[in-house]
């Protein structure tokens, strides 16, 4: 695609190329033969985040308490607001507009990967030799008791939801 | 003041092209676009496409892209203008204009005819 | 694209009379409205850009007005000369448009 009429960072408006506006800054009127453009610096709690002809700035986000949101990185006149959730709690997207309690993992669950402001907790089944007995949004599935080192033997198989239970050896009488 | 000077009179067959030269004065050329617009016999007024001398940018109207060709030489302030595979309603005025706020000065035309 | 339409197609006015001629966008074009006048065997010639900029050597005769799609050029007392076409142009969006023109004779 060959170049347009007018370079980067300039517009096309009645047959001349006028300059953008920077990031920060909201069209007031285009240039003409014998002026610049005119631009004005947005507002409090405003922003533009390119070189833009706009006539109004984005407000910024508000990160809404009541759905968990907290500021993660305040907004300037250039950037828009980043909201993240409450401990416990992460985005129901990637615009992070909600949050949600984390999930937890049921028993025979562990977690393999704990839960973030922006993902959830990730679970995974016990494999045999492990269990959780708990629904827990932090805990591993554990490794099943080792009867042997400590000179026990197994009395109840374990499952993905109990530990083995070891007892003494039988002894000959 | 300032100029613009349009080459003459064009007859064209059908599928031939034809090329138009439109010759600045008068003001920095490469200061100000360069628009194309034509006008058929009896009709109103239709934008081709504007040209940056400056450094050759374009913009054409989706009807006239593929078939038309806008340049500019700089060292003899001079646009043109090309319209390939001609048919029988291209046949019209063609003027060049220079930017500025509006068409600001205009050429004094140039008429291709196409005609088997 | 932008459609511009001007009325009436042809304006019949007296010497000295006033001239009031329209042209409307089929959308908003911020005020991005140039009038032109052709007349047989003469250059076009710009009499007003964005909407209301005289262009320079116009008489002040000539004077535009309007926002949004409506616009109104306005010859407040005609001259002999100024019997001839005139045609709207918006500079808002690509692709530049122009009206049909409205002829301005002599009653």
């Known amino acids: 695609e060959p170049p347009t009429a007018c370079r980067e960072k300039q517009y096309l408006i009645n047959s001349q190329c006028c300059s953008l506006c920077q990031p920060g800054q909201k069209l007031v009127s285009d240039c003409t033969e014998f002026t610049e453009t005119e631009c004005l610096p947005c507002g409090e709690s405003e922003f533009l985040d390119t070189w833009n002809r706009e006539t109004h700035c984005h407000q910024h986000k508000y990160c809404d308490p009541n759905l968990g949101l907290r500021v993660q990185q305040k907004g300037t006149s250039e950037t828009d607001t980043i909201c993240t959730c409450e401990e416990g709690w992460h985005c129901t997207s990637e615009a992070c507009e909600s949050c949600v309690l984390h999930r937890s993992c049921s028993p025979g669950f562990g977690v393999k990967q704990i839960a973030t402001g922006v993902s959830d907790t990730i679970c995974e089944p016990c494999p045999v030799g492990f269990f959780s007995n708990v629904s827990s949004a932090f805990e591993k599935c554990h490794p099943w008791t080792s009867c042997e080192t400590k000179d026990l033997v197994v009395q109840q198989a374990g499952t993905n939801k109990t530990d083995v239970v070891c007892g003494p050896q039988d002894r000959l009488r | 003041q300032v100029q613009l000077v349009q080459s003459g009179a064009e007859v064209k067959k059908p599928g031939a092209s034809v090329k138009v030269s439109c010759k600045a004065s008068?003001?920095?050329?490469?200061?100000?676009?360069i628009e194309w617009v034509r006008q058929a016999p009896g009709q109103g007024l239709e934008w081709i496409g504007v040209?940056?001398?400056?450094?050759?940018?374009?913009n054409y109207n989706e009807k006239f892209k593929g078939r038309a060709t806008l340049t500019a030489d700089k060292s003899i302030s001079t646009a043109y203008m090309e319209l390939s595979r001609l048919r029988s309603d291209d046949t019209a005025v063609y003027f060049c204009?220079?930017?500025?706020?509006?068409?600001?000065?205009w050429g004094q035309g140039t008429l291709v005819t196409v005609s088997s | 694209e932008i459609v511009m339409t001007q009325s009436p197609a042809t304006l019949s006015v007296s010497p000295g009379e006033r001239a009031t001629l329209s042209c409307r966008a089929s959308?908003?074009?911020?005020?991005?409205l140039n009038w032109y006048q052709q007349k047989p065997g003469q250059a076009v010639r710009l009499l007003i850009s964005?909407?209301?900029r005289l262009h320079s050597g116009i008489p002040a005769r000539f004077s535009g007005s309007g926002s949004g799609t409506e616009y109104t050029l306005t010859i407040s007392s005609l001259q002999s000369e100024d019997f001839a076409v005139y045609f709207c142009?918006?500079?808002?969006?690509?692709?530049?448009?122009f009206g049909q023109g409205t002829k301005v004779e002599i009653k």
């Open positions: 040209i940056n001398p400056g450094y050759g940018g374009v």
């Open positions: 959308q908003d074009i911020s005020n991005h």
């Open positions: 142009q918006q500079g808002n969006t690509l692709p530049w448009t």
């Open positions: 964005s909407t209301s």
């Open positions: 204009a220079r930017g500025g706020s509006g068409f600001a000065f």
């Open positions: 008068g003001y920095g050329f490469t200061n100000y676009l």
